[in-house]
Interface confidence: low
């Protein structure tokens, strides 16, 4: 299990390193993104973990950002981030149905209402359980 | 009404043990981070630990492996452990709520506890 | 990692003046920090979340400002009941911390 585990985040911050670099290839990060939505968490160990990653890197104010599966619904008021950036990424993951193109990809300033807490835990304890 | 109340401050030896309690009201420990701090007398605020919704915690580096935080979703209620207690460890200790999004501050706060660490 | 610095540790002011406290972090923390009042004997209280976000209750004569390493906190005309210790504290990151607070601000009367 131990090595499972180890796998595990091997792979996971495998693919939060290559996020969205190759739009041909997007199995894992929808598996990743279905994690992040469903354990409403946000990274491996913490929600920084994306702000490493070049493809979610602009410029300046917004140099921080992460995928919309790490933004938490239930906290927000802003409709307009709502029904334009967020709703419409959450769906697909929703219904895990069309595989996502590159230009889908969908990141919100990390300033908004992100996850507190990486998925490790919880990905952790759902191997424990299982 | 949303409310923390601590209890289990006191005196205690140098070296010794003690466990703070927190018992929350009028929301569920298990959807939140929730957080110890302590205020040595006539001193700042300082950060203890934290425990995640999921149950994954931090500590300050200073409380690793002396402190230990936990709690039990049925009782709704938060604990500190803290062992080999030093006279530096006198302070009131509070339990904050911080919540679930990254961002949210520490509200609201218990009264606090006083522990006290001398011979 | 992620230390606070806060500034001045003491400011002398009377009812009605214009008083700044700042906190300077030392990595850029975006803008999660808070702000808290506490006075002697109580439990602080969240004035201010989100760097600029005033907290429920709150009256408006507080303001937060700032981003990245720099923050203000801002009473546009000093009351009565203002006259307390004011902290900062950082909500960026929990892991490898010494503290996540600024080291306090008192506010006292001049």
């Known amino acids: 299990r131990a090595q499972l585990e180890r796998s595990l985040r091997d792979v996971v911050e495998k693919t939060i390193q290559k996020y969205g670099t190759n739009p041909e290839e997007t199995a894992a990060e929808e598996s990743w993104d279905y994690v992040q939505f469903q354990l409403r968490c946000c990274g491996w160990h913490y929600p920084q973990d994306w702000f490493q990653v070049l493809i979610l890197r602009g410029n300046g104010s917004e140099a921080h950002r992460v995928p919309c599966s790490c933004y938490n619904l239930s906290a927000t008021n802003d409709s307009t981030i709502l029904d334009k950036v967020i709703l419409p990424q959450l769906s697909r993951l929703g219904h895990l149905a069309r595989s996502r193109h590159s230009a889908d990809i969908c990141a919100v300033p990390a300033e908004s209402h992100i996850y507190r807490e990486g998925c490790a835990q919880g990905l952790q304890k759902w191997l424990h359980n299982n | 009404e949303v409310q923390l109340v601590e209890s289990g401050g006191g005196l205690v030896q140098p070296g010794g043990s003690l466990r703070l309690s927190c018992a929350a009201s009028g929301f569920s420990l298990s959807y939140n981070a929730m957080n110890w701090v302590r205020q040595a007398p006539g001193k700042g605020l300082e950060w203890v630990s934290i425990?995640?919704?999921?149950?994954?915690?931090d500590y300050a580096s200073w409380a690793k492996g002396r402190f230990t935080i936990s709690r039990d979703n049925s009782k709704n209620t938060l604990y500190l452990q803290m062992n080999s207690l030093r006279a530096e460890d006198t302070a009131v200790y509070y339990c904050?709520?911080?919540?679930?999004?990254?961002?949210?501050?520490?509200?609201?706060w218990g009264q606090g506890t006083l522990v006290t660490v001398s011979s | 990692a992620y230390d606070m610095t806060q500034s001045p540790s003491t400011l002398s002011a009377s009812v009605g003046d214009r008083v700044t406290i700042t906190c300077q972090a030392s990595q850029n923390i975006i803008d999660y920090l808070a702000w808290y009042q506490q006075k002697p004997g109580k439990a602080p209280k969240l004035l201010i979340h989100?760097?600029?976000t005033l907290a429920s209750g709150v009256p408006s004569r507080f303001k937060g400002s700032g981003s990245g390493t720099e923050f203000t906190l801002t009473i546009s005309s000093l009351q009565p009941d203002d006259f307390a210790t004011y902290y900062c504290?950082?909500?960026?990151?929990?892991?490898?911390?010494?503290?996540?607070f600024g080291g306090g601000t008192k506010v006292e009367i001049k």
């Open positions: 504290q950082q909500g960026y990151s929990n892991s490898n911390i010494d503290n996540t």
């Open positions: 904050a709520r911080e919540g679930s999004t990254w961002g949210d501050a520490l509200d609201p």
């Open positions: 989100k760097a600029s």
């Open positions: 425990i995640f919704a999921s149950g994954r915690t």
